[in-house]
């Protein structure tokens, strides 16, 4: 018969022919052939693989690096990775959960909804037409525009979101 | 290396007055946020007061309002918080902290304690 060119789901193709992949938690000692199985081995302690697989070493857990501010969430096992949480009050600066900080600041543009808590990071909202904010900060609110008129003068630049209006003496028409 | 040396804490009766001091060394102090969080035995970090780079604007959480003020000394590098009014309840190890707020940056903190 011919050679195969493409095999079933759970298997991989090696020296044409169809080998079956090593299930989630065990890695591949040897491929099959014709005459014998894929020999697959489970993952060491501190190891995992999470998918069907033909890889020839596991991967390591995830260390939670507590100067980092990082605890384990969820033991890794031979088939998923650990999963890290920052300490109470710290807040993950991704999904990935690498590092933990105190808190988000919120950038020039945008202001301040709600500050961080325990529990919830930092809420930030762009600042509307009116408001600017040009600092990066975890507490100030978007501050409005500096109102021209009310100091006598008239808008010499316009706000932006990030910017304060400049305001400019009134051009004195002469007689 | 960005360092925060938190000093000024101690054993004070209610009512009492303290001023913590933050010195900061290997960074441009002037122009970062800062702020004073603080963490009682067995709970969570509270934060308790930031003050802006500039130091224009200030922020206070409502369980010390009124008592306690912020303020800065660019000059000599050096962040305080003057607590007055001093409750059981803001025992706790006050710690100060700069944008980026990672967890490395922190410093060892001070340990104030209020009872009579």
């Known amino acids: 018969p011919e050679p195969p060119t493409a095999c079933r789901e759970k298997q991989y193709l090696i020296n044409s022919q169809c080998c079956s992949l090593c299930q989630p938690g065990q890695k591949l000692v040897s491929d099959c052939t014709e005459f014998t199985e894929t020999e697959c081995l489970p993952c060491g302690e501190s190891e995992f693989l999470d998918t069907w697989n033909r890889e020839t070493h596991c991967h390591q857990h995830k260390y939670c690096d507590p100067n980092l501010g990082l605890r384990v969430q969820q033991k890794g096992t031979s088939e998923t990775d650990t999963i890290c949480t920052c300490e109470e009050g710290w807040h993950c600066t991704s999904e990935a959960c690498e590092s933990c900080v105190l808190h988000r600041s919120c950038s020039p543009g945008f202001g301040v909804k709600q500050i961080a808590t325990g529990v919830s990071d930092t809420i930030c909202e762009p600042c509307p037409v009116g408001f600017f904010s040009n600092v990066s900060s975890a507490f100030e609110k978007c501050h409005p525009w500096t109102s021209c008129e009310t100091k006598d003068l008239v808008v010499q630049q316009a706000g932006t979101n990030k910017t304060d209006v400049v305001c400019g003496p009134q051009d004195r028409l002469r007689a | 290396e960005v360092q925060l040396l938190e000093s000024g804490g101690g054993l004070v009766q209610p009512g009492g007055s303290l001023r913590l001091s933050c010195a900061a060394s290997?960074?441009?102090?002037?122009?970062?946020?800062l702020w004073w969080v603080r963490q009682a035995p067995g709970k969570g970090l509270e934060r308790v007061s930031a003050?802006?780079?500039?130091?224009?604007?200030?922020y206070y959480a409502d369980s010390v309002k009124g008592r306690f003020t912020i303020s800065r000394d660019d000059s000599k590098n050096t962040l305080y918080l003057q607590m007055n009014s001093l409750r059981a309840e803001d025992t706790a190890v006050y710690y100060c902290a700069k944008d980026p707020y990672s967890f490395d940056y922190r410093g060892q903190g001070t340990l104030v304690t209020v009872s009579s």
């Open positions: 003050i802006s780079g500039s130091g224009g604007s200030t």
């Open positions: 290997g960074f441009t102090f002037a122009g970062y946020e």
